[in-house]
């Protein structure tokens, strides 16, 4: 169950999809990826206040226990709910080829 | 790909399964759950240093970009990789019934 999408911390402060531009060098991929030279990495960033985009029952439990024991139990964390696949031109010993990666770019986000 | 399981921060400091004892009151469940009165909640807690239990390519990217832009990109987060189901005796308008919840207790953990 995806709980409330209203962010009590103000617009854009809570868990949501962000895009970060990164070069192959930034990613440490220059030795095994030929293209693209730059990737628009979509990732999940932001706070997870009480019940905001709670992914499941476990996330709701985590919220309750974090409120009670903040030093022991961390707040839920903003992570991908699903991914968009991406193709890379990959260098191998036998040459270059197109390879699809299913878990590279976040598609949407939730708190867990 | 689950990357290295060696924790560079010292034993028990990195992302792993913890058990937290919680009452129905702690969980805010007293009004809709009859039993159990207390739950041994298994949850994922701990740091996610570079490539420790990286869940996938996205987690590896996050590690690289966090190193470059720590104020913009957070480190990967310790979350459940899978869950153990649990049965609860649930109160309803028509009485009580056994209900199984698949996403309540963490089974194992990874960094994402």
């Amino acid at each position: 169950a995806r709980n409330g999408d209203h962010c009590p911390l103000g617009p854009g402060r809570c868990c949501r999809l962000h895009t970060v531009r990164a070069s192959l060098e930034d990613l440490g991929w220059a030795d095994w990826v030929l293209s693209p030279r730059e990737v628009q990495v979509t990732m999940c960033i932001g706070a997870c206040p009480s019940q905001f985009r709670a992914a499941n029952m476990h996330a709701q439990i985590k919220t309750s226990l974090h409120r009670l024991k903040p030093d022991t139990v961390p707040a839920p964390c903003c992570v991908p709910a699903s991914y968009n696949p991406m193709v890379l031109i990959q260098k191998t010993d036998t040459g270059v080829s197109l390879q699809t990666y299913d878990d590279l770019l976040a598609k949407d986000c939730h708190c867990i | 790909a689950r990357n290295g399981d060696h924790c560079p921060l010292g034993p028990g400091r990195c992302c792993r399964l913890h058990t937290v004892r919680a009452s129905l009151e702690d969980l805010g469940w007293a009004d809709w759950v009859l039993s159990p009165r207390e739950v041994q909640v298994t949850m994922c807690i701990g740091a996610c240093p570079s490539q420790f239990r990286a869940a996938n390519m996205h987690a590896q990217i996050k590690t690289s970009l966090h190193r470059l832009k720590p104020d913009t990109v957070p480190a990967p987060c310790c979350v459940p990789a899978s869950y153990n189901p649990m049965v609860l005796i649930q109160k309803t308008d028509t009485g009580v019934s056994l209900q199984t919840y698949d996403d309540l207790l963490a089974k194992d953990c990874h960094c994402i």
């Epitope: 030929l34 693209p36 193709v87 699809t100 | -």
Partner: antibody
């Protein structure tokens, strides 16, 4: 590995509209970076790039033919289409579709032949 | 449009020979060049991507080189199955353009 197969009418009369279909498997056009191109080759001549469609529905056309070309896709059915209006005998050729990403056009279909004749 | 010129339209060589096919662009294409092989039955296969990168599965006797406007494809030890027409193609900018092709025949 990607496999692609073109299909078309085979024969058209001048001024008619050509509708080509590229059916593919082994990849998806929902994948970021992926695209499909159409290329043609008149018998005994060279290759001519016509159009390209990206995963995000961005399209590119050969400028001299742009007014006559329309490329489109049905991502869920793994198909790409090309329409050429007002065909002429100069459009008689073998038409290929090919998978492409970042300029790497790695797999081509076997081609479908079109003859324009009155 | 960028013009791609393959000056040699046909080439005759013996089995075992080293064969070089050249391609010139009308402007600098920054190594954004593919080489293709087209068999007599019309089948087209990618050999080289980005001027010098062998496509996976292509025999290592094929190699590509060049920079700026001048590029070449080399077959180091010609085999019977290499009888085909070879095309260069630039993808530096749209519209993508091909060379006229070089038909390779056995002496």
């Amino acid at each position: 590995q990607g496999t692609l197969k073109e299909s078309g009418p085979g024969i058209l009369q001048p001024s008619q509209t050509l509708s080509l279909t590229c059916s593919f498997s082994g990849f998806s056009l929902s994948i970021s970076g992926m695209g499909v191109s159409w290329i043609r080759q008149p018998s005994g001549k060279g290759l001519e790039w016509l159009a390209h469609i990206y995963w995000d529905d961005d399209k590119r056309y050969k400028p001299s033919l742009k007014s006559r070309l329309t490329i489109s896709k049905d991502t869920s059915r793994n198909q790409v289409f090309l329409k050429i209006t007002s065909v002429d005998t100069a459009d008689t050729a073998t038409y290929y579709c090919a998978r492409s990403a970042y300029g790497m056009t790695d797999y081509w279909g076997q081609g479908t032949t079109l003859t324009v004749s009155s | 449009d960028i013009q791609m010129t393959q000056t040699t339209s046909s080439l005759s060589a013996s089995l075992g020979d080293r064969v070089t096919i050249s391609c010139r662009a009308s402007q600098d294409i920054s190594n954004y060049l593919n080489w293709y092989q087209q068999k007599p039955d019309g089948t087209v296969k990618l050999l080289i991507h980005s001027a010098s990168n062998l496509h996976s599965g292509v025999p290592s006797r094929f190699s590509g080189s060049g920079s700026g406007t001048d590029y070449s494809l080399t077959i180091s030890n010609l085999e019977q199955e290499d009888i085909a027409t070879y095309f260069c193609q630039q993808y530096n900018m749209f519209p993508w353009t091909f060379g006229g092709g070089t038909k390779l025949e056995i002496k």
